[in-house]
């Protein structure tokens, strides 16, 4: 058993049929010694008396809010949560496996630049009685500070018969140099509590590996005289690290119709303009990627050919 | 320590081409190592990230773009003295700061070159003959060093009398390649910045 936060404790249980469970001793936070009784949740049934209560925690029915009282007055609470371990593996029931970039990916994180600011998100089908808390650091043995905000519900989607909820959190490394060469990864830890179930999820990464620039901005087309070619120009996104001559991007320019199966024109360039063949009912799209360290491409920025 | 903006005339920057070749060569070598040593811990997640130049050179700080010198997190620079007679910029306007940056890059390359050559000598003794260093990568390191054209003491190649542990050598190769790739990215950024200034 360990303390998650004040008056909230996590009991780690090996979860299998007829498991013996864990013996837990609760102590009432009071100077009083006599006349103390214990109850669980809203029940008025007295579970025991005395300053300490010993219980055998085996299942969710044994978890919950234990309260010690004296003469009708509440002295203190202890909330017990369960953390299940099945076949030596901690349960991951609360969050959905996003399977990208590999299986057992519950947390996904992205950074728009090298400033040390990043966003992580996760998915769940649970809509109520759900809380998250996020901690992060650079390195684990001698951790350096990363400050994370509160996790918020950022999107709701319908997937077949189920509703899916996306939560996200923004974090900022306390003293980040965009030009630094990372040798210690960022660690992100998410505590998830659903009703009386506790789970924790972690992710470890270098900012350089989760870079995904914003799409290029200000796409403009200039038809070339006596030609079917069009000069398309754009600018670096505002959110990208500066100076751009140091933090350079490379671009992919594509002309395609509405269907992905349609024919296309595609060219890669390090410049902020390119010449392509425009077709009726097609769009010109441009996306960006770090020129020197190939992490993710940005989303497309698009303009119609016409 | 930072790069001032007053720099060379356009087209006078032969190092940019060499640095691009360097990044390409080390990336290819790292990819080859990951594929060949698939049953060794050779991915970014599996290895310890060591920097053999730590406390010996300070390329990131010495080559910091002027725009980032206002960022206090970038300025915990280590004091290191460097030779300052580089010819890569082919311009008399080469400032002291820039020479410091380029000589730091030169020292990085020299240290990695020695490590890689020592390691290759060990790998050539491996009866499995599983992996060797790409001669192209070694040649590209040499070309960039020549373009930088700093005079510095030659570091003797480390020779070891004991029987090499090939497993450890291959893991060290992965660690070195990952670190060198990251440094090659920095070098490419620096050269691009100087070329544009």
């Amino acid at each position: 058993i360990w303390e998650l936060k004040k008056d909230v404790y996590v009991v780690e249980l090996d979860w299998y049929p007829d498991a013996p469970g864990e013996m837990v001793v609760l102590t009432c936070d009071t100077p009083e010694e006599d006349g103390i009784t214990w109850t669980l949740d809203q029940s008025s049934e007295v579970l025991g008396s005395g300053k300490t209560l010993t219980i055998q925690v085996k299942e969710f029915g044994d978890a919950g809010q234990y309260t010690c009282h004296k003469g009708g007055e509440v002295l203190s609470h202890s909330l017990l949560l369960l953390h299940k371990k099945e076949d030596g593996i901690w349960s991951t029931d609360i969050l959905k496996d996003q399977k990208e970039p590999k299986n057992k990916t519950f947390l996904r994180c992205e950074a728009k630049n090298y400033s040390g600011r990043f966003t992580c998100w996760w998915l769940t089908t649970i809509s109520t009685d759900l809380t998250f808390s996020v901690k992060s650091s650079r390195g684990s043995s001698d951790p350096q500070g990363v400050t994370c905000g509160a996790a918020t519900l950022s999107a709701e989607r319908v997937r077949g018969d189920n509703k899916e909820y996306e939560y996200s959190v923004e974090c900022q490394e306390d003293s980040a140099c965009p030009a630094a060469e990372e040798s210690l990864p960022i660690e992100v830890m998410v505590d998830a509590v659903h009703k009386l179930k506790y789970e924790n999820y972690t992710s470890s990464f270098f900012i350089r590996d989760i870079i995904k620039p914003d799409p290029p901005k200000n796409l403009q087309l200039k038809p070339l005289k006596n030609s079917r070619q069009v000069e398309v120009s754009w600018e670096y996104p505002d959110t990208w690290s500066t100076p751009h001559s140091y933090f350079s991007l490379t671009f992919c320019v594509q002309v395609q119709g509405k269907s992905k199966r349609e024919k296309k024109d595609r060219v890669f360039t390090d410049k902020t303009s390119a010449t392509v063949i425009c077709r009726k009912n097609a769009s010109i799209s441009v996306r960006a990627q770090d020129r020197y360290y190939s992490s993710s491409w940005s989303e497309w920025a698009s303009v119609p050919c016409s | 320590r930072n790069l001032p903006v007053a720099t060379p005339d356009p087209g006078m920057f032969p190092c940019l081409h060499h640095s691009q070749n360097l990044l390409r060569a080390v990336s290819n070598m790292l990819q080859k190592a990951r594929q060949t040593l698939e049953f060794y811990p050779c991915t970014s997640e599996e290895i310890d990230h060591e920097d053999i130049t730590k406390d010996k050179t300070s390329t990131v700080e010495a080559c910091l773009p002027l725009e980032l010198t206002k960022n206090e997190s970038c300025l915990n620079s280590r004091e290191t003295s460097f030779i300052t007679n580089g010819s890569c910029l082919a311009s008399r306007k080469t400032s002291f700061m820039m020479a410091l940056c380029l000589s730091s890059i030169y020292e990085d390359l020299k240290m990695y070159q020695v490590e890689f050559k020592t390691m290759n000598a060990k790998l050539l003794m491996d009866p499995k003959r599983q992996i060797f260093l790409d001669q192209n990568m070694l040649a590209v390191i040499d070309e960039l060093m020549q373009a930088l054209n700093f005079n510095s003491e030659t570091v003797p190649q480390k020779s070891s009398l004991e029987e090499p542990d090939f497993y450890k050598t291959k893991i060290k190769l992965c660690i070195l390649l990952h670190a060198f790739r990251i440094r090659a990215v920095t070098i490419d950024r620096v050269m691009s910045y100087l070329n544009a200034s």
């Epitope: 079917r228 070619q229 490379t250 199966r261 349609e262 024919k263 296309k264 024109d265 595609r266 060219v267 890669f268 360039t269 390090d270 010449t275 063949i277 077709r279 009726k280 | -």
Partner: antibody, heavy 118, light 107 residues
């Protein structure tokens, strides 16, 4: 299976014209860009131009501009390349080729040898 | 026009040995570079597109690398069926241009 079948070999006199055909099968004709590339005996590949059969748009290499005409007939899934004012150095194998991507080629015809000789 | 220069023009290789062909562009072309194989009396066949992207059905011993002006096609272990002429082609701008070809011959 996408296939491009070209017309047979031709022998032409200098100053005349040649029209080579290329019939496509497998896939929708207008879903692909069609290119013409030639190869002189023992020499390398030389790109001549492309056509978008959907709208008839064409682009020619400056070297052939004014001498080459590429057309397409959607109803028969056939493309044509006509080269005029032939000279002996136009002796080559002419390939039609296609791809959904405009700038490189993934399916080639078998080639048509055009010999220009007096 | 962008001029593509291949080297060497002839490459004698022992079967089972690796081979590398270089292609240089007269100006920077990013990764707009494609490789083809041509055997005598046959049409060319696409091997690699956009410098390093492999084609399904092409053996994994063929790999491409490079960007900017310098590109390499590598065959990790030459098989008897790989003896052919190899061409690079740039697609950075029109007109599309090819290298002059490299003939890989049995040593």
């Amino acid at each position: 299976q996408v296939q491009l079948v070209q017309s047979g070999a031709e022998v032409k006199k200098p100053g005349s014209s040649v029209k080579v055909s290329c019939k496509a099968s497998g896939g929708t004709f207008s879903d692909y860009y069609l290119h013409w590339v030639r190869q002189a005996p023992g020499q390398g590949l030389e790109w001549m131009g492309w056509i978008d059969p959907e709208n008839g748009d064409t682009e020619y290499a400056p070297k052939f501009q004014g001498r080459v005409t590429i057309t397409a007939d959607e109803s028969t899934s056939t493309a044509y390349m006509e080269l005029s004012s032939l000279r002996s150095e136009d002796t080559a194998v002419y390939y039609c080729a296609r791809n959904k991507e405009l700038r490189y080629i993934d399916v080639w015809g078998q080639g048509t040898l055009v010999t220009v000789s007096s | 026009d962008i001029v593509m220069t291949q080297s060497p023009l002839s490459l004698p290789v022992t079967p089972g040995e690796p081979a590398s062909i270089s292609c240089r562009a007269s100006q920077s072309i990013s990764i707009n570079l494609h490789w083809y194989q041509q055997k005598p009396g046959q049409a060319p066949r696409l091997l690699i597109y956009f410098a390093s992207q492999s084609i399904s059905g092409v053996p994994s011993r063929f790999s491409g690398s490079g960007s900017g002006t310098d590109f390499t096609l590598t065959i990790s272990s030459l098989q008897p069926e790989d003896f052919a002429t190899y061409y690079c082609q740039q697609s950075n701008s029109f007109p599309l241009t090819f290298g002059q070809g490299t003939k890989v011959e049995i040593k």
